[in-house]
């Protein structure tokens, strides 16, 4: 903390401008009014002060609002923002996308720090879901985003918000949250075609039932290999053969290089010799010809 | 991350020198750099300073006389210093204002310092 000192004569600041990186941080306490600076914070931005020099006018900001700052001020807050820490953040009502867009612009190009993902926390929880734009806004950002939500978080995402997700917003999603977020893709693109649904769909289908499985290896998609290793292995499980040389069309023969891995491991154990060997792949491990296959599942269901 | 300077020395009154500053390290980027003077008995001062924008800012007792600089591909910030008087004797450090990843916080960060004698 500063000492509280006087001004010197001649120096207070009638504006926030370039003139202040002489000043020393005593004199920046003393000669800098707080709320001139709430109402010029646009101009600090460009003015290369140091952090030590910064952190005294955090401090006057702070005296100045003590139950957080409003909106007209955090979204000029510029390269001030990267001290601000998380404790600072939770008391801001941010309600502007060109706020947090303004914010996210400081910290553009890097991992999501700790005070980006509160004020991203904020934001959210400040507009109650995850509208089109906000979304559109945070993975063009992070694309990784999406990712990071919990299940509980990716529900409130309205089936509408799928359209701003690109394949990549999906990289480093878990099947979990796939589970989520593939029933609202569903609904969201359900009014287009074969092929064009399937395009948008793809990226989503690690959380895809059985039946919806089934019901696509009728529309001749050609699923390539990387799509259907991230199916769910209790999806494909039931799957025919049949019904996956539907699914993957030409890329079939792809099974091969896989057969060690899962889902296709799994798979092959439940299918019959008999019928993987129509694949001409050379696929071992299915049932051998005359072993009755009983489902234990469904006994257990029964019982 | 490092800041390190170089081009310091000693030089006779109406001369020349060019300092430079390269930075060097990882999960850091640079917004505003700066270069500061320190003469003996007295307290670190701004000299010239450069915005991440490119605006630049000198100390009155140097305009006209001293310009900063920055080359973004080399991570290198200069200050060319021309007409040099006896006053401008001191020790000169870099400075950028900058950002790291790993703690999470916007941080000031300097240079060792580099000498300059004038006379």
């Known amino acids: 903390e500063v000492e509280k000192t006087a001004c010197p004569s001649g120096k207070k600041a009638r504006e926030i401008d370039e003139s202040l990186i002489f000043y020393k941080k005593w004199e920046l306490e003393a000669c800098v009014d707080a709320a001139l600076l709430a109402t010029q914070m646009d101009r600090v931005n460009a003015i290369p002060f140091t952090y030590e020099q910064l952190d005294v006018l955090k401090h006057k900001l702070d005296e100045l609002y003590p139950q957080g700052y409003p909106e007209s001020v955090i979204q000029h807050l510029g390269y001030l923002f990267l001290k601000m820490s998380p404790e600072d953040i939770r008391k801001w009502n941010v309600t502007s996308l060109e706020t947090l867009k303004a914010l996210l612009e400081v910290n553009k190009g890097h991992e999501m720090s700790p005070q980006v993902a509160t004020l991203i926390d904020r934001f959210v929880k400040g507009r109650g879901q995850l509208d089109k734009d906000t979304l559109d806004t945070l993975t063009a950002f992070y694309p990784g985003y999406l990712c990071s939500l919990s299940p509980e978080e990716l529900s409130s995402v309205p089936p509408s918000s799928i359209w701003a997700v690109r394949p990549q917003d999906l990289d480093t999603c878990d099947p979990r949250q796939l589970d989520v977020l593939y029933p609202k893709a569903r609904l969201a693109f359900q009014n287009m075609n074969g092929s064009e649904y399937f395009v948008k769909i793809q990226s989503f289908l690690g959380g895809a039932p059985t039946e919806d499985l089934k019901a696509l290896s009728q529309q001749n998609v050609s699923m390539d290999l990387a799509t259907f290793m991230k199916l769910r292995t209790d999806a494909v499980l039931p799957l025919t053969v049949a019904e996956v040389q539907k699914l993957l069309g030409p890329h079939v023969e792809g099974l091969k290089a896989e057969e060690r891995h899962r889902p296709v491991r799994d798979w092959i154990l439940r299918q019959r010799q008999d019928d993987l060997d129509t694949l001409g792949l050379g696929l071992q491990g299915g049932i051998p010809n005359g072993y009755l296959v009983l489902d234990l599942s469904m006994q257990e269901a029964l019982s | 991350v490092q800041l390190v300077e170089s081009g310091g020395g000693l030089v006779q009154p109406g001369g020349s020198l060019r300092l430079s500053c390269a930075a060097s390290g990882s999960m850091f980027s640079i917004n505003a750099v700066a270069w500061y003077r320190q003469a003996p008995g007295e307290q670190r001062e701004p000299v010239a300073a450069?915005?991440?924008?490119?605006?630049?800012i000198y100390a009155d007792s140097v305009k006209g006389r001293f310009t900063i600089s920055r080359d973004n591909a080399k991570n290198t910030v200069y200050l060319q210093m021309n007409s040099l008087k006896p006053e401008d004797t001191a020790v000169y450090y870099c400075y950028a204002q900058g950002y790291d990843y790993d703690e999470g916080y916007g941080m000031d960060y300097w240079g060792q310092g580099t000498s300059v004698t004038v006379s």
């Open positions: 450069m915005t991440s924008g490119g605006s630049t």
